[in-house]
Interface confidence: medium
């Protein structure tokens, strides 16, 4: 025997109190698949969360974060505050990247500058808190006669300066 509830489409639930009639989901609830015996409560985007998509009878609301924050986790389950480029978020708030590290985004951690010498290259542009170094041609390519480009002074090795 086929379950009569399997005929209930998304946006409805199989109401056991009414002889398994398909009843529409009540306000502020939804069912995204057919054959449901209950409707799920819609997510509410409160506080730092903003509504990106309203709840409907067949799909949950979707949230994003208010300006100055960004989403974390599946379905934007959390909001995390932005920092400026050249900073990372710590327990003490936004802190500048240590010398030798950079962050070119408003989120995430400071990462070490690229070590150009590992690839046999020279530093073309020094790194900053906001930008990685730019590696240039290898020193061999800059030997007399090979090029007229004068290599810039190499950047200091990555290290941690006190904050």
């Amino acid at each position: 025997l086929q379950d009569p509830c399997s005929n209930c489409p998304a946006g409805t639930f199989c109401d056991n109190n009414r002889n398994q009639i398909c009843s529409p989901c009540p306000p502020n609830s939804f069912s995204s698949a057919g054959g449901q015996r209950t409707c799920d409560i819609c997510r509410q985007c409160k506080g730092v969360f903003r509504t990106r998509k309203e709840c409907s009878s067949t799909s949950n609301a979707e949230c994003d974060c208010t300006p100055g924050f960004h989403c974390l986790g599946a379905g934007c389950s959390m909001c995390e505050q932005d920092c400026k480029q050249g900073q990372e978020l710590t327990k003490k708030g936004c802190k500048d990247c240590c010398f030798g590290t950079f962050n070119d985004q408003k989120r995430g951690i400071c990462r070490p500058w690229t070590n150009c010498s590992l690839d046999g290259k020279s530093v073309l542009v020094n790194g900053t808190k906001e930008r990685d170094v730019v590696c240039g041609p290898s020193p061999a390519d800059l030997s007399p006669g090979a090029s007229s480009v004068t290599p810039p002074a190499p950047a200091r090795e990555p290290g941690h300066s006190p904050q």
Epitope: G47, V48, L72, G73, S77, M78, C79, E80, Q81, L89, T90, K91
Partner: nanobody, 123 residues
């Protein structure tokens, strides 16, 4: 239901004091970092202070250091913000928020917020 409810806001003169409270319910309060944020009229939300699970770590935005004190009482599921030497620029809606539980990589994310309490500093 997971809930945070702030109270204690009001109108105060410059140099005055207020103590904000945040009552938590519906989750194991002592497992989470807790955070105070504020939003001045027309401005973005600003982090004010945070406190770890047992109250041994506390951090503040530079503009409130030495004037504001964050604390918590895990026995009563309560978070507090003692605000002294208040200034006009402290006028804002103050929100408490639940932070990370220390076991996830979303350590600095917030997922539960209160409705806010308004602090007005004016003579």
């Amino acid at each position: 239901e997971v809930q945070l409810v702030e109270s204690g806001g009001g109108l105060v003169q410059p140099g005055g004091s207020l103590r904000l409270s945040c009552a938590a319910s519906g989750f194991t309060f002592s497992n989470y970092w807790m955070i105070w944020y504020r939003q001045a009229p027309g401005e973005e939300l600003e982090w004010v202070a945070n406190i770890n699970q047992d109250g041994s770590e506390k951090y503040y935005v530079d503009s409130v250091k030495g004037r504001f004190t964050i604390s918590r009482d895990n026995a009563t599921n309560s978070l507090f913000l003692q605000m002294n030497s208040l200034r006009a620029e402290d006028t804002a809606v103050y929100y408490c928020a639940r932070g990370g539980d220390g076991y996830s990589n979303s350590h600095y994310g917030m997922d539960v917020w209160g409705q806010g309490t308004t602090v007005t500093v004016s003579s």
